[in-house]
Amino acid sequence: LNTTILTPNGNEDTTADFFLTTMPTDSLSVSTLPLPEVQCFVFNVEYMNCTWNSSSEPQPTNLTLHYWYKNSDNDKVQKCSHYLFSEEITSGCQLQKKEIHLYQTFVVQLQDPREPRRQATQMLKLQNLVIPWAPENLTLHKLSESQLELNWNNRFLNHCLEHLVQYRTDWDHSWTEQSVDYRHKFSLPSVDGQKRYTFRVRSRFNPLCGSAQHWSEWSHPIHWGSNTSKENPFLFALEA
């Protein structure tokens, strides 16, 4: 019989009685092998992906995911209905908008179906895991001879987002950054007409509606300056 023993400290003789549990296929193993951590992100409050690193399992394992909301009307345990796969092995679960309740404690449980006692539960505050879509429709307006105003739109409740504007000229080696609150506009008071400027923006679900740490992707950049039309200085140029 070529079966195996697995122990978490290498000393199988002194610890076997404490760690061993009977497993399928006539093998013995520990029940303490940790499951991978689940990472969830709520994309623009349209859907949520909860993912894990399936490669960390010592054998190919289709881990299963269940979820519920703690102390709420939605506390019934739900099975994942839409698994994400990485090379034929489950590596995540996608939840749709109707299943997302931002301000209730989300409980997610990962389980090994080969060894049902091997499970891990995490509690998450979804309002801190929202990632908005990148800002769109960037526009530039010349307020005066030397002042530019940048505006943009977000596909979300504007008051929930803060923004980070970056700009630089073609003479600069690095970006200049400016934080912007929920108002989604930015003014650059002193513009050099001889230089070409590039602007881009990203947004974050913080601080009014949540405390998310992750920013959106950067917007497509918008350019203004020396090679913009000379005939009409109030025109803006948008380049992806």
């Epitope: 697995l6 978490p8 290498g10 399928p24 193993s29 092998l33 190919p60």
Partner: antibody
């Protein structure tokens, strides 16, 4: 590029301990997605898996029951290597011993060069 | 434990031949079957992982197929450097990792 370099004596006396080391370059012994194996090849048993170690927030060890009670695999994070100790050897343990990494899709994607071990007094 | 059975245990073939080696698992292993080539005095070398995926750097004349319990390794046009011993290995249910007994491919 991952490389595994084996070292250790090729001659062991019966009843003594066989000790081999596998030095890793291009990966970490404490990677949270790899596992590190010892395998041997003999004419009588073909390729035979002996055991493995892997790190998932703590160290884990799997051993084949064909050598259980005689085998220990030890990772050494400071030297980025892992070792095989097989005690109470008999002529049945004479074989070519290999270390190997479990990598992509749970295949053994990198192997050491092999060490021919003879058991003789 | 899952037992792996290869056939044939040895075969003779000529350069340019198409060669097929089969491997059968004692229970379903999905597509978690790997193929290795071993030459005398050398370590085994991974050829095919996950039944049909070609390992980087391996010539395209090698291919793998199968799922469940029955798998094949095919060499479409045998080259002189292909004469070696070939092993299958399951990674579906470990431990233990189990190998086939090997197929020795010789020059006719």
């Amino acid at each position: 590029q991952v490389q595994l370099q084996q070292s250790g004596p090729g001659l062991v006396k019966p009843s003594q301990t066989l000790s081999l080391t596998c030095a890793i370059s291009g990966d970490s012994v404490s990677s949270n997605i790899a596992a590190w194996n010892w395998i041997r090849l003999s004419p009588s048993r073909g390729l035979e898996w002996l055991g493995r170690t892997f790190f998932r927030s703590t160290w884990f060890y799997d051993y084949s029951l064909s050598v259980k009670g005689r085998i220990t695999i030890n990772p050494d994070t400071s030297k980025n290597q892992f070792s095989l100790h097989l005690n109470s050897v008999t002529p049945e343990d004479a074989a070519v011993y290999y270390c190997a990494r479990t990598g992509r899709r749970w295949s053994l994607d990198y192997w050491g060069q092999g060490t021919l071990v003879t058991v003789s007094s | 434990d899952i037992q792996m059975t290869q056939s044939p245990s040895s075969l003779s073939a000529s350069v340019g031949d198409r060669v097929t080696i089969t491997c059968r698992a004692s229970q379903s292993i999905s597509s978690y079957l790997n193929w290795y080539q071993q030459k005398p005095g050398k370590a085994p070398k991974l050829l095919i992982y996950a039944a049909s995926s070609l390992q980087s750097g391996v010539p395209s004349r090698f291919s793998g197929s199968g799922s469940g319990t029955d798998f094949t390794l095919t060499i479409s046009s045998l080259q002189p450097e292909d004469f070696a011993t070939y092993y299958c290995q399951q990674s579906y249910s470990t431990p233990p990792i189990t190998f086939g007994q090997g197929t020795r491919l010789e020059i006719k």
